[in-house]
């Protein structure tokens, strides 16, 4: 994966929040859980109340990448997705808000996300190679693709 | 059906160890974390401790470091708590409850057991 | 800490009536409040949850509502069986404090 300092010298400015409160379910429908107060999982849900409710703020690139940069906070608090390594279980950071600028290390807290028809894909913006996964009984962590499933479907309006 | 049952009530002497045991069934084990919870005689629900059940580690309350120790079986989806130097001061009935986040953000008890009384009387 | 502050301590109404706990958080909570109930002798049971949401199995007469750091929890009709004590508890942070109960007895 590529280092942090590959990216250090971007810098991304907070734009605003683009979605509030939406459900994401990977491509074996299994909605993405919060088992802990530091990691996510994946599980088949009968209770979608049990799912993580996700805001999704957007962030411009001073180098006018035509990406759409992301950060991915769980709605009514203050914990953020940050990337770890391949195969290491994405965090929850908790920060007193929304980071306005954002450059160097800091890059594992946001994602390009991109979409194909109904899928869609979080790339690590600290690892560009490696997306969002879930993991067969293992926590949502970064992968560059199978086994691991990298595809998710966003479900929006479900209070 | 969720099931979370316990171990059987026991009776000890101060200074004695009590180990209580509770086996989950109906949900995917490590996919939830465990509690906890105390309640001596006529008090409030005390929150001793939470239980990691894909790593086994634990979150004690400050009440609660020292004599407790919290461990697991997830091969058989168990959660155990041990109390060592018993003092009449431990008698209380102790619950084990699994921990859910609704929304991701929402912290709730869901399912609990039916309690285990520990006695300690010389 | 959170501090959850429930009241009243006791209270004692009729079959039939309408009934009303509230719980009050030291700070904003975000709607994490729930509401259990334990009958004597019993083990406790989630009612409630996320301030307003009815657990699997739970009868409709109970409801919840509230914002920042009030709430209240109601039994529309009291029936017999719900003679127990009720608790709050706050979900938003640790340790995710329970408040000291209310027993409801039957006049």
């Known amino acids: 994966s590529a280092p942090f300092s590959f990216l250090s010298n971007v810098k991304y400015n907070f734009m605003r929040i683009i979605k509030y409160e939406f459900i994401l379910n990977d491509a074996l429908n299994q909605s993405i859980i919060r088992a802990n107060d530091q990691y996510l999982t994946a599980a088949a849900l009968h209770n979608l109340d049990e799912a993580v409710k996700f805001d999704m703020g957007a962030y411009k690139s001073s180098k006018d990448d035509a990406k759409i940069t992301v950060i991915l906070r769980i709605s009514k608090t203050q914990l953020y997705v940050t990337a770890q390594d391949e195969d290491q279980p994405v965090l929850l950071k908790e920060m007193p808000e929304i980071p306005k600028t954002i450059t160097g290390s800091e890059t594992n807290l946001l994602f390009f996300w991109e979409t194909h028809g109904t899928k869609n894909y979080f790339t690590s913006v600290a690892h560009p190679n490696l997306f969002i996964a879930t993991k067969q009984d293992y926590w949502v962590c970064l992968a560059g693709g199978p086994p691991s499933i990298t595809d998710f479907q966003i479900l929006e309006n479900q209070a | 059906e969720i099931q979370l049952v316990q171990s059987g009530s026991e009776l000890k002497k101060p200074g004695a160890s009590v180990k209580v045991s509770c086996k989950a069934s109906g949900y995917t084990f490590t996919n939830y974390g465990m509690n906890w919870v105390r309640q001596a005689p006529g008090q409030d629900l005390e929150r001793m401790a939470w239980i990691n059940t894909y790593t086994g580690e634990s979150t004690y309350a400050d009440d609660f470091k020292g004599r407790f120790v919290f461990s697991l079986d997830t091969s058989v989806s168990t959660a155990y708590l041990q109390i060592s130097s018993l003092k009449a001061e431990d008698t209380a009935v102790y619950f084990c409850?699994?921990?859910?986040?609704?929304?991701?953000?929402?912290?709730?008890?869901?399912?609990w057991g039916q309690g285990t009384t520990v006695t300690v009387s010389s | 800490d959170i501090q959850m502050t429930q009241s009243p301590s006791s209270l004692s109404a009729s079959v039939g009536d309408r009934v009303t706990i509230t719980c009050r958080a030291s700070q904003d909570i975000s709607n994490c409040l729930n509401w259990y109930q334990q009958k004597p002798g019993k083990t406790p049971k989630l009612l409630i949850y996320?301030?307003?949401r009815l657990h699997s199995g739970v009868p409709s007469r109970f409801s919840g509502s509230g914002s920042g750091t009030d709430y209240t929890f109601t039994i529309s009709s009291l029936q017999p069986e719900d003679i127990a004590t009720y608790f709050c508890?706050?979900?938003?942070?640790?340790?995710?404090?329970f408040g000291q109960g209310t027993k409801l007895e039957i006049k």
């Open positions: 508890q706050q979900g938003k942070t640790l340790p995710y404090a």
């Open positions: 996320y301030t307003s």
């Open positions: 409850a699994r921990g859910i986040y609704y929304y991701g953000s929402s912290y709730a008890m869901d399912y």
